[in-house]
């Protein structure tokens, strides 16, 4: 029977700069029941605080709701593991909410084959930003990436769409069924997961020539 091993805060993520969650990996438990607590203070503050919500983010997590989240402050946090034989502390982690944003995937992905009479046919892809992101405030710039592939292909073709929420693709294989997905990323932060795939059948008479 031993004191607990050193825990590690391995990830903090925010969906929108308004809330965030951090997760830790427990160390060894020393063969005894072990309690974990996350404590933090903010830059310029010596008063310590405890995690306000150990439930929302699941096991070994701390969730900071709106009233505990500030974009303008660095959080300095650590996890304490305690059992009957003693305690151990994680290294301090410095968290700036601006840099940990991982949005939800974009929504309402729509894909359509357009075949104008006077121009080359193309695949038209359109989507909406994730609900939790308020682009009107100017706090956010979202960048988008599209990937697509024929249903049975192994390799994805990736296109960077910048800040626009629609995109045209000209080069496609006629007669193939394609999977299309989109994801987004804030200017500072992490790519979202890919949106659920949308399928589109490319007509056999779709011409690929440039």
């Amino acid at each position: 029977q031993l004191p607990p091993g050193k825990p590690e805060i391995f990830k903090c993520r925010s969906p929108n700069k308004e809330t965030f969650t951090c997760w830790w990996r427990p160390g060894t438990d020393g063969g005894l029941p072990t309690n974990y607590s996350l404590t933090y203070h903010r830059e310029g503050e010596t008063l310590m605080h405890e995690c306000p919500d150990y439930i929302t983010g699941g096991p070994n997590s701390c969730h900071f709701g709106k009233q505990y989240t500030s974009m303008w402050r660095t959080y300095i946090m650590m996890v304490n593991a305690t059992n009957q034989m003693g305690s151990s502390f994680s290294d301090e982690l410095y968290v700036d909410v601006t840099y940990i944003v991982q949005p939800d995937p974009p929504l309402e992905l729509a894909v359509e084959v357009k075949q104008p009479e006077d121009r080359k046919p193309y695949l038209w892809i359109k989507w909406s930003p994730p609900t939790l992101i308020d682009l009107k405030t100017g706090w956010f710039t979202l960048l988008y990436e599209i990937r697509l592939k024929p249903e049975k292909a192994a390799e994805w073709e990736i296109h960077f769409a910048g800040q626009q929420t629609e995109f045209k693709i000209l080069s496609l294989h006629p007669g193939q069924k394609y999977l299309v997905q989109v994801r987004c990323k804030p200017d500072h932060g992490y790519w979202s997961a890919w949106s659920p795939a949308t399928f589109i059948q490319i007509p056999s008479d779709f011409t690929m020539n440039d």
Partner: antibody, heavy 118, light 107 residues
């Protein structure tokens, strides 16, 4: 609607004890840092104790350290202050305060009067 | 402990006038700073937190400014219900401390 209701105040002799309670409703008590603040005509407002969501972090003012004990029961949405070895200078209105925004108490009870006198 | 000194101790003004209350900290508190209003027989009411953010339900005539050691609460145009005692508070470090209060009275 948020309610914080203090009870347990009263008249006590110097050296005596009292246990104050604060019943909370209308918010997720278990997530909030809680505090006891007192107010005397002479000293104004004095923050005397602070307890974190799961009682991991506890602070006391030097004036009450070793005599007062703060505790909470999240299952019962209750905050407590055990006051021992009471002195005349502990006479005050005692407020419980719930922290909601970055450690600023936005919710206060109406207070309970503690009078220490022989 | 961090000592907060409020000035003036009493401020006599008329409704419609602008009120400026000051608070100085004995050492830097960054912007972990608040202003409260208290009326007789009531608990203090949070007006401003983080030096300049208005608490929920507080009218826009109340504004806070400052960081470090010097802070100001401004009431742009006094309403009759604003006459009360105002306290500043720091919560950068323990013990959390209050100023001694400024009494805002009707002239």
């Amino acid at each position: 609607e948020v309610h914080l209701v203090e009870s347990g105040g009263g008249l006590v002799q110097p050296g005596g004890s009292l246990r104050l309670s604060c019943a909370a409703s209308g918010f997720t008590f278990s997530s909030y840092e809680m505090n006891w603040v007192r107010q005397t005509p002479g000293k104004g407002l004095e923050w005397i104790s602070h307890i974190s969501s799961r009682s991991v972090i506890i602070y006391y003012a030097d004036s009450v350290k070793g005599r007062f004990t703060i505790s909470r029961d999240n299952a019962k949405n209750s905050l407590f202050l055990q006051m021992n070895s009471l002195r005349a200078e502990d006479t005050a209105v005692y407020f419980c305060a719930g922290i909601t925004i970055f450690g600023i108490p936005e919710y206060w009870g109406q207070g309970t009067l503690v009078t220490v006198s022989s | 402990e961090i000592v907060l000194t409020q000035s003036p101790a009493t401020l006599s003004l008329s409704p419609g006038e602008r009120a400026t209350l000051s608070c100085r900290a004995s050492q830097s508190v960054s912007s972990y700073f608040a202003w409260y209003q208290q009326k007789p027989g009531q608990a203090p009411r949070l007006l401003i937190y983080d030096a300049s953010s208005r608490a929920t339900g507080i009218p826009t005539r109340f504004s806070g400014s400052g960081s470090g050691t010097d802070f100001t609460l401004t009431i742009s145009s006094l309403e009759p219900e604003d006459f009360a005692v105002y306290y500043c508070q720091q919560r950068s470090s323990w013990p959390i401390t209050f100023g001694q209060g400024t009494r805002l009275e009707i002239k």
